[in-house]
Interface confidence: low
C-alpha cells in the first residue's frame, strides 16, 4: 500500500534503534571517508526529521522519497569535492540517477587502515561509558570498509558484539573472555560480507533472474518438502530484499526481510519442519537463524529426475510453452534432491540442461538427442568433487598456513601480474576454506568449499576490475559467475609473463619483524613467497620449500639472537645469496 510519508512508514515499522542503525550504515557505505561524528550528526538530523513526519505526515518534505531525502543530506556535506573527488558530480544529477551514481562510486577496497581492536580494558571502559556510541562506531567502521554488507545482518552482528561485551566486561579476565568470542564474530562477519558482495555482483552484472535462480536452488536444498509454488514465492521475496540492500535501500530491505521472516514463521507447515527454534527468537536473531537453518529431511518418495525431464514425451512442448517455469522446476527438483551439491554446480547443471534443450528441441528427433543429458552431467559433477578431495587432502597434510602458501604459489603462477598484496589476501582467504569446510561431514564439504571459493574469487574479480593487469584474470572474471571458479581452477602458469628481476631489498628484513603478531609475520613471509614466484614462476615446489624453510630458520635464529639488528644485517645478505642459488 502507498504511504503518504515513506520515511514515517519506515520509522514506524523499524523502530528508532534499527532505523538509526540502518541510516548510519547507509551513510557510511556511501561516503566511506567521513568520520563517525560527521555521520552521527547526519543520522540524528534524519531521525529528528522522521519523527516530525511521524507526528504529521503532511509536514514539509515528508512526502519525498528516501533517496531524495538521503541524497540531499549527503550532498549538503561541506567540502564534498575536496574529499570525494568526482563523487561530488553525483549531486548535479536528479533521482534516480543520483543514487545510481552514488552506488557506482562505492569502493570495495577503500584506503582505510585495517580495523584494530583496542585492549579489552579500553573497550570495556568505552562500552560502559556509552554503549550506543560504541555500537555506532562499530557499525560505521564495518560499513565503510564493506560498502555492500547486508545491512540487517550487520545490525545482528552489532547485537552479538553488544552481548559479548556485556558478558565479558563483567568478568575478571576480560581479555580471555573477549578475544575468542570477538574473533568468532569477526570471522563470521567477514564471510557474510564476501557472500553478500557475491549476491550484489550477481544482481548488478546479470540481473534479478540470475539471483532468483540462485535463490531457487538454495531454498530448494534447504526446504525440500516445500512445493515449487512456495519456493518461487520465497525466492521472489528474497530477491526483492537483496535487490533493495544491494541498491542502497536499506530501510526497505530490513523491513521486507522482517516481513519475510514473519511469513516463514507463520507458514512453517508448508515450508519446513526445522524452523521452530528460529521462530522463537527475537527479530534479528530470527532472520539470521532462518538464513542458515539446517536442511529439512528430504521426502523419501521422490521419483527419479529423469521421469519429468528426460523420459516425458512432452519435454520440448513444456519447455517451449514456458521456458523459465520449466527450467525453474528442473532446478527446484534437482536441487531438492542434492543438498550435497554446491549452488554453483546446480546452476551449471541447469545451464547445461537448458543448452541441451535449446539444441535438441530444434532437431528432428529431440528425445534421442536429449536422452543422454543426465549422463553428460557426470563430468560437471566430478570436477568439483575432485577439487574438494584434492584440496582437503592437501589442507590435512599442510595445515592452514601451509595450505595458504600452496594456494599462493598456484595463484601467483596463474596471474603473476596481480599485485602481491591482492594475491596474498586472496590466498589467505582461499586457504581458510580448509579450516572452514574440510572438517565438515562428507556431504557438506562440496557446497561449503565451492560456494565459499566462488565468493572469494568474486572479490578477486572486483579488485582486478579496478586495475586490470592479467589477461588470465580478465578472462575468468568476464564469464558467468558460476563458471568463474572452474575457470580459475583450470588456469595454469602464465607463459606470457616476463619474470621480475631479483631485487635484494624485496627479501631484506629487519628486527622489527620479530615483534609483529603471528598473523602479520605470516603476511610478511607470504609476501616474500609471492615475490619469489614472480621472480621464478617455474620454480619447483621443492625449490620454494627449501627457500621458505631457510627463511623461517633465519627469522627464528635472528629473533632469538641477543643482538637482533646485527644478526639481520649480517645473516640477511647471506640468506639472499642462498635464495638466489637455490632458485638458479
Amino acid at each position: 500500500e502507498a504511504h503518504k510519508s515513506e520515511i514515517a512508514h519506515r520509522y514506524n515499522d523499524l523502530g528508532e534503534q534499527h532505523f538509526k542503525g540502518l541510516v548510519l550504515i547507509a551513510f557510511s557505505q556511501y561516503l566511506q571517508k567521513c568520520s563517525y561524528d560527521e555521520h552521527a550528526k547526519l543520522v540524528q538530523e534524519v531521525t529528528d526529521f522522521a519523527k516530525t513526519c511521524v507526528a504529521d505526515e503532511s509536514a514539509a518534505n515528508c512526502d519525498k522519497s528516501l533517496h531524495t531525502l538521503f541524497g540531499d543530506k549527503l550532498c549538503a556535506i561541506p567540502n564534498l569535492r575536496e574529499n570525494y573527488g568526482e563523487l561530488a558530480d553525483c549531486c548535479t544529477k536528479q533521482e534516480p540517477e543520483r543514487n545510481e551514481c552514488f552506488l557506482q562510486h562505492k569502493d570495495d577496497n577503500p584506503s582505510l587502515p585495517p580495523f584494530e581492536r583496542p585492549e579489552a580494558e579500553a573497550m570495556c571502559t568505552s562500552f560502559k561509558e556509552n554503549p550506543t556510541t560504541f555500537m555506532g562506531h562499530y557499525l560505521h567502521e564495518v560499513a565503510r570498509r564493506h560498502p555492500y554488507f547486508y545491512a540487517p545482518e550487520l545490525l545482528y552482528y552489532a547485537e552479538q558484539y553488544n552481548e559479548i561485551l556485556t558478558q565479558c566486561c563483567a568478568e575478571a579476565d576480560k581479555e580471555s573472555c573477549l578475544t575468542p568470542k570477538l574473533d568468532g564474530v569477526k570471522e563470521k562477519a567477514l564471510v557474510s560480507s564476501v557472500r553478500q558482495r557475491m549476491k550484489c555482483s550477481s544482481m548488478q552484472k546479470f540481473g534479478e533472474r540470475a539471483f532468483k535462480a540462485w535463490a531457487v536452488a538454495r531454498l530448494s536444498q534447504t526446504f525440500p518438502n516445500a512445493d515449487f509454488a512456495e519456493i518461487t514465492k520465497l525466492a521472489t521475496d528474497l530477491t526483492k530484499v537483496n535487490k533493495e540492500c544491494c541498491h542502497g535501500d536499506l530501510l526497505e530491505c530490513a523491513d521486507d526481510r522482517a516481513e519475510l521472516a514473519k511469513y516463514m514463521c507463520e507458514n512453517q507447515a508448508t515450508i519446513s519442519s526445522k524452523l521452530q527454534t528460529c521462530c522463537d527468537k527475537p527479530l534479528l536473531k530470527k532472520a539470521h537463524c532462518l538464513s542458515e537453518v539446517e536442511h529439512d529431511t528430504m521426502p523419501a518418495d521422490l521419483p527419479a529426475i529423469a521421469a519429468d525431464f528426460v523420459e516425458d514425451q512432452e519435454v520440448c512442448k513444456n519447455y517451449a510453452e514456458a521456458k523459465d517455469v520449466f527450467l525453474g522446476t528442473f532446478l527446484y527438483e534437482y536441487s531438492r534432491r542434492h543438498p550435497d551439491y554446491s549452488v554453483s554446480l546446480l546452476l551449471r547443471l541447469a545451464k547445461k540442461y537448458e543448452a541441451t534443450l535449446e539444441k535438441c528441441c530444434a532437431e528432428a528427433n529431440p528425445p534421442a538427442c536429449y536422452g543422454t543429458v543426465l549422463a553428460e552431467f557426470q563430468p560437471l559433477v566430478e570436477e568439483p568433487k575432485n577439487l574438494v578431495k584434492t584440496n582437503c587432502d592437501l589442507y590435512e597434510k599442510l595445515g592452514e598456513y601451509g595450505f595458504q602458501n600452496a594456494i599462493l604459489v598456484r595463484y601467483t603462477q596463474k596471474a603473476p601480474q596481480v599485485s602481491t598484496p591482492t594475491l596474498v589476501e586472496a590466498a589467505r582467504n582461499l586457504g581458510r576454506v580448509g579450516t572452514k569446510c574440510c572438517t565438515l561431514p562428507e556431504d557438506q564439504r562440496l557446497p561449503c568449499v565451492e560456494d565459499y571459493l566462488s565468493a572469494i574469487l568474486n572479490r578477486v574479480c572486483l579488485l582486478h576490475e579496478k586495475t586490470p593487469v592479467s589477461e588470465h584474470v580478465t578472462k575468468c572474471c568476464s564469464g558467468s559467475l558460476v563458471e568463474r571458479r572452474p575457470c580459475f581452477s583450470a588456469l595454469t602458469v602464465d607463459e606470457t609473463y616476463v619474470p621480475k628481476e631479483f631485487k635484494a631489498e624485496t627479501f631484506t628484513f629487519h628486527s622489527d619483524i620479530c615483534t609483529l603478531p603471528e598473523k602479520e609475520k605470516q603476511i610478511k613471509k607470504q609476501t616474500a613467497l609471492a615475490e619469489l614466484v614472480k621472480h621464478k614462476p617455474k620454480a619447483t615446489a621443492e625449490q620454494l620449500k627449501t627457500v621458505m624453510d631457510d627463511f623461517a630458520q633465519f627469522l627464528d635464529t635472528c629473533c632469538k639472537a641477543a643482538d637482533k639488528d646485527t644478526c639481520f644485517s649480517t645473516e640477511g645478505p647471506n640468506l639472499v645469496t642462498r635464495c638466489k642459488d637455490a632458485l638458479a
Epitope: 582505510l112 580495523f115 584494530e116
Partner: nanobody
Amino acid sequence: EVQLLESGGGLVQPGGSLRLSCAASGFTLDYYAIGWFRQAPGKEREGVSCIASSGGSTNYADSVKGRFTISRDNSKNTVYLQMNSLKPEDTAVYYCAAAVLECRTVVRGYDYWGQGTQVTVSS
C-alpha cells in the same frame, strides 16, 4: 567537554631534541588512535606519526623515520612524540588528533583536534 591539549613545543637548535605531549580530557584515550600532524606557514597540514589505540601499530612519515618516536601512556591519558636530531625543516605548528581505534590515511578521518604547539628549529 572533549579536549586535546598539546604541550612541549619551543625553540631548539638544529640537532636538538623536544618531547611533545598530547593530553586528553573529557574522554578516555584508550579507545582512540592518536596522530601527530604539522603545518608550516603557507603549507598543507601533513601527517607526522600515528599510534593505534592498542599501541601495537605505529607509523611515521618518511621525513621523520628514525628520528621521531611516538608512544602512549594510557594511565596518564597522554600520547608523546619524542623528536630527536631536529632540523630547520621540522619547524611548524604541531597538532595531535584522535580517531576511533586506528590511524587514518586522510586528515579528515580524525574526529578530535588539539589547538597546536609551535616548534621552531633554528640556530
